[in-house]
């Protein structure tokens, strides 16, 4: 349904508050270095313009596309070339190339200062003095650091952020009330950002078909009672929503997401019995709740898959008539029966099935050729099962920090060319799979673990893509979306790597380490561990563990010393010399 003015249509659908918030997110995700005040000014100008279009859809420029309007506005920024360099060249292009150009310049790792949390009293004062600016600043700071954050979900986070301050700034112990809530929002926000980043990578690097396959598998697990046609409709709509958000079309995305939530709630009976509570909530909470809803119970007495997909004489006929529909049905049927499998495993099985049909339907006796296709699934299922079992045992034996360290060593030896901060960040996140998933019973471990690992390995892939340094990482990241994790798992020590030259500065520590939080201190130690492996890739696990224990003893000693800085300087030299002597650094 065409509208005379797209901007007026979205303003009316979303309301002024959401319109302004979403435009701010869009602008901050494109121009990540611009000051807050500049973005607020641009957003206010766009909003005033939108209001004129609501009043008269035939007014000048109201018929322009949102990309044209927003792009023109972004291109008015005076400091575009000096701040963003070649991104300024985007402004010489016409739509849709201009928007594509802006999208290509989104930076997953922008050079922005770490967000430091002020004192609680300072935050509460700022919140009370100007609530609107305080909340806008939150949207701005998150959006510019996470340029693919799912915009309608960021509105939900902002609503929770506001609620936390509203409640806690009146509490007797403000800090005890507020800080745990902010920690939770921060951790959930990072996880949400990473999950959305994988969706966008899936769409942008592997195409709509890959995303749709993922969505069919996931929604079939979640809604196993829904008919295939219903799941297909949801997949089509969900794909549109995520395509829009990943493409910077945040107003359309938020609007369509609201429509999808409305549709799901109006059709609960044919979708899932688990949606009742979600559908009683207000819009933002409702959409979030639906996205996180638990899997419905599987229908009783589902027939064997073999009948339709192996034993039937019509397999090749059905496949030839509509390949993607037939494969989609296979994926739907398999996924709804297997909530215990990861989505990526289900996609591997579907790919194996597709490859077998491609080969066998051209053979002399197709049925004879594909009769044993399900036997090919067994090793594909067992591989992640065994890997998860081994790693959960290791996690339970070591605890999270030391499990992370084991992964740090493992991944640094696999891809030593990758930057140390990236290896630390990714390995720490890989290590969190233990606490997140190993507590679950067998039936929930694989979907938890392997789908989480897909999200984390995508972080590695997008960070590496910005500055490619390893052919092995590029290969694992680009060859197959669903085989990324097995590809990285299969990597052995990189024997071609020339050890990094020793640099004493890398191993120089100062008294500031004593005042760091436990998490920050761990990151310092893990950074040293990665550097150690890069210098000495042949060091044994035992040697590395022993050197790290020396490091811990050194830090503990100097943090207890009266003259800490002198201790770090003198004892640090001794530690480096001792490690050099022992490892031949």
């Amino acid at each position: 349904d065409a509208h005379k003015s797209e901007v007026a249509h979205r303003f009316k659908d979303l309301g002024e508050e959401n319109f302004k918030a979403l435009v701010l997110i869009a602008f901050a995700q494109y121009l990540q270095q611009c000051p807050f005040e500049d973005h607020v000014k641009l957003v206010n100008e766009v909003t005033e313009f939108a209001k004129t279009c609501v009043a008269d859809e035939s007014a000048e420029n109201c018929d322009k596309s949102l990309h044209t309007l927003f792009g023109d506005k972004l291109c008015t920024v005076a400091t575009l070339r000096e701040t963003y360099g070649e991104m300024a060249d985007c402004c010489a292009k016409q739509e849709p190339e201009r928007n594509e150009c802006f999208l290509q310049h989104k930076d997953d790792n922008p050079n922005l200062p770490r967000l430091v949390r002020p004192e609680v009293d300072v935050m509460c004062t700022a919140f009370h003095d100007n609530e609107e600016t305080f909340l806008k600043k939150y949207l701005y700071e998150i959006a510019r650091r996470h340029p693919y954050f799912y915009a309608p979900e960021l509105l939900f986070f902002a609503k929770r952020y506001k609620a936390a301050f509203t409640e806690c700034c009146q509490a007797a112990d403000k800090a005890a009330c507020l800080l745990p809530k902010l920690d939770e929002l921060r951790d959930e926000g990072k996880a949400s950002s990473a999950k959305q980043r994988l969706k966008c990578a899936s769409l942008q690097k592997f195409g709509e078909r890959a995303f749709k396959a993922w969505a069919v598998a996931r929604l079939s697990q979640r809604f196993p009672k829904a008919e295939f046609a219903e799941v297909s409709k949801l997949v089509t709509d969900l794909t549109k929503v995520h395509t829009e958000c990943c493409h910077g079309d945040l107003l359309e995305c938020a609007d369509d997401r609201a429509d999808l939530a409305k549709y799901i709630c109006e059709n609960q009976d044919s979708i899932s019995s688990k949606l009742k509570e979600c559908c009683e909530k207000p819009l933002l909470e409702k959409s979030h709740c639906i996205a996180e809803v638990e899997n419905d119970e599987m229908p009783a007495d589902l027939p064997s898959l073999a009948a339709d997909f192996v034993e039937s004489k019509d397999v090749c006929k059905n496949y030839a008539e509509a390949k993607d529909v037939f494969l989609g049905m296979f994926l739907y049927e398999y996924a709804r029966r297997h909530p215990d499998y990861s989505v990526v495993l289900l996609l591997r099985l579907a790919k194996t099935y597709e490859t077998t049909l491609e080969k066998c339907c051209a053979a002399a006796d197709p049925h004879e050729c594909y009769a044993k296709v399900f036997d090919e699934f067994k090793p594909l299922v067992e591989e992640p099962q065994n890997l998860i079992k081994q790693n959960c045992e290791l996690f339970e034996q070591l605890g999270e920090y030391k499990f992370q360290n084991a992964l740090l060593v493992r991944y640094t030896k696999k891809v030593p060319q990758v930057s140390t901060p990236t290896l630390v960040e990714v390995s720490r996140n890989l290590g969190k799979v233990g606490s997140k998933c190993c507590k679950h019973p067998e039936a929930k471990r694989m979907p938890c673990a392997e789908d989480y690992l897909s999200v984390v390995l995508n972080q590695l892939c997008v960070l590496h893509e910005k500055t490619p340094v390893s052919d092995r990482v590029t290969k694992c990241c680009t060859e197959s979306l669903v085989n990324r994790r097995p590809c990285f798992s299969a990597l052995e020590v990189d024997e071609t790597y020339v050890p990094k030259e020793f640099n004493a500065e890398t191993f120089t520590f100062h008294a500031d380490i004593c005042t760091l939080s436990e998490k920050e201190r761990q990151i310092k130690k893990q950074t040293a561990l990665v550097e150690l492996v890069k210098h000495k890739p042949k060091a044994t696990k035992e040697q590395l563990k022993a050197v790290m224990d020396d490091f811990a003893a050194f830090v503990e000693k100097c943090c207890k010393a009266d003259d800490k800085e002198t201790c770090f300087a003198e004892e640090g030299k001794k530690l480096v010399a001792a490690s050099q002597a022992a490892l031949g650094l």
Partner: nanobody, 124 residues
Amino acid sequence: QVQLVESGGGLVQAGDSLRLSCAASGRTFSDYAMGWFRQAPGKEREFVARINWSGTLTYYADSVKGRFTGSRDNAKNTVYLQMNSLKPEDTAVYYCAQRGDSGSNYDPSGYSYWGQGTQVTVSS
């Protein structure tokens, strides 16, 4: 199972020297730091020295710094504590211990395996 056996203790005059030895068997000796601790009657067990896995880095308690020297011979699975200029306040049972997988390097709780101890008595 790890076994640690100390030897070399005895009764000496103030100002004299003693050399304690600790022979280890069990898990790979060279993978772990070793510690020397002591316990005087009616007192807590206290840290004396830590000798790292390769013998290239040693940390001491302030009370023994400059008088005691820790060393190890990984080929012989043995760790040593050379004690010079002994004082009456050094009187205690001396224990050698093998580092555990976690905890403080300067606290008994950070060490997993212990010897039975050897008595050192310094008379004035």
